[in-house]
């Protein structure tokens, strides 16, 4: 089971209208450039077999991957939103740095790996798709971690 006290974000992190709006604007702009609407990264498959108490830990993994493998490499695109949203998400990632799971997290790593593989397989369009789903990442992170 997760060490729940560390797998938590304060509600106030998600009660900042300006950065929430910028995150959703960034997602909207990127989704307009996403021509692969059949695939969804953040959906039922990602959470399959994951209990309520493990959801935040899973979302931490997704957040870290999105920052390191998608947002940082694409940081010159979708301005001015990107330069504001990336530091915000990086702060959330930092706050979840002590969120760990005691015991087996293989089922979670397997689910996250499928998301990573999908993004990598799609190449740059996979990265655009991930940015286009930042609204879902934001909301899923909120719902899982507060």
């Amino acid at each position: 089971a997760p060490i729940s006290s560390h797998c938590r974000l304060d509600k106030s992190n998600f009660q900042q209208p300006y950065i929430t709006n910028r995150t959703f604007m960034l997602a909207k702009e990127a989704s307009l450039a996403d021509n692969n609407t059949d695939v969804r990264l953040i959906g039922e498959k990602l959470f399959h077999g994951v209990s309520m108490s493990e959801r935040c830990y899973l979302m931490k993994q997704v957040l870290n991957f999105t920052l390191e493998e998608v947002l940082f490499p694409q940081s010159d695109r979708f301005q001015p939103y990107m330069q504001e949203v990336v530091p915000f998400l990086a702060r959330l990632s930092n706050r979840l740095s002590t969120c760990h799971i005691e015991g087996d997290d293989l089922h979670i790593q397997r689910n996250v790996q499928k998301l990573k593989d999908t993004v990598k397989k799609l190449g740059e369009s996979g990265e655009i798709k991930a940015i286009g789903e930042l609204d879902l990442l934001f909301m899923s992170l909120r719902n899982a971690c507060i």
């Epitope: 089971a1 509600k11 998600f14 953040i42 959906g43 039922e44 959470f47 399959h48 077999g49 994951v50 209990s51 309520m52 108490s53 959801r55 879902l136 909301m139 899923s140 909120r142 719902n143 899982a144 507060i146």
Partner: antibody, heavy 119, light 112 residues
Framework: EVQLVESGGGLVQPGGSLRLSCAVS????????MIWVRQAPGKGLEWIGI???????YYASWAKGRFTISRDSSKNTVYLQMNSLRAEDTAVYYC?????????????WGQGTLVTVSS | AVVLTQSPSSLSASVGDRVTITCQAS??????LAWYQQKPGKAPKLLIY???TLASGVPSRFSGSGSGTDFTLTISSLQPEDFATYYC??????????????FGGGTKVEIK
């Protein structure tokens, strides 16, 4: 094909107990949480409680103490134990699968089983 | 606990009409809102989640919008099979789990 079938409803006297069953097929209870919802005659939907993948249970405040959700994964069945029943517990009781997609959504639902509490 | 207020509680409409149902939350629920359709004697059926995402197999004449506290379900051109009762449902996280899932009172769509 995913299917949920409730059973165990019927007529029970005030103060009595009843155990409802929800038999599932087409998916595993180790992969999905399950909820119970009820609907009094001519009224709206009311959430009762949920049993998570790991067996943890959570209840609506009004249901705590009288209602208990459990499961038997080997039988692919979820149960709702109802005690100290009152006339106002008369309702159709539904089970549904909880699909978390970043937010909880309930799909599909069973056909429901009617519980009538009357003397 | 969040309270969801649906309006109207009932409405009469004709086939082909555009129908709009609203759901107001007593607190900010972001986009954590779903819509369900229920026909007499049947179980509810998921129509929309994330306030605006159409569930699999649901006709495109159904659409949802809104965020925060005000939400709308629209049927662009009412069909005979759409006469039913519609419920909004919210998920509220971060509070006590005993009030996580809440349903609105329902809106009955009847034939004019």
């Amino acid at each position: 094909e995913v299917q949920l079938v409730e059973s165990g409803g019927g007529l029970v006297q005030p103060g009595g107990s009843l155990r409802l069953s929800c038999a599932v097929s087409g998916f595993s209870l180790s992969s999905y949480a399950m909820i119970w919802v009820r609907q009094a005659p001519g009224k709206g939907l009311e959430w009762i409680g949920i049993i998570d993948i790991d067996g943890s249970t959570y209840y609506a405040s009004w249901a705590k103490g009288r209602f208990t959700i459990s499961r038997d994964s080997s039988k692919n069945t979820v149960y709702l134990q109802m005690n100290s029943l009152r006339a106002e517990d008369t309702a159709v009781y539904y089970c549904a699968r909880d699909r978390f997609v970043g937010v909880d959504i309930f799909e599909p639902w069973g056909q429901g089983t009617l519980v009538t509490v009357s003397s | 606990a969040v309270v969801l207020t649906q309006s109207p509680s009932s409405l009469s409409a004709s086939v082909g009409d555009r129908v709009t149902i609203t759901c107001q939350a007593s607190e900010d629920i972001y986009t954590n809102l779903a819509w369900y359709q229920q026909k007499p004697g049947k179980a509810p059926k998921l129509l929309i989640y994330w306030a605006s995402t159409l569930a699999s197999g649901v006709p495109s004449r159904f659409s949802g919008s809104g965020s925060g506290t005000d939400f709308t379900l629209t049927i662009s051109s009412l069909q005979p099979e759409d006469f039913a009762t519609y419920y909004c449902q919210a998920c509220v996280y971060g509070n006590s789990a005993d009030s996580r899932y809440t349903f609105g009172g329902g809106t009955k769509v009847e034939i004019k």
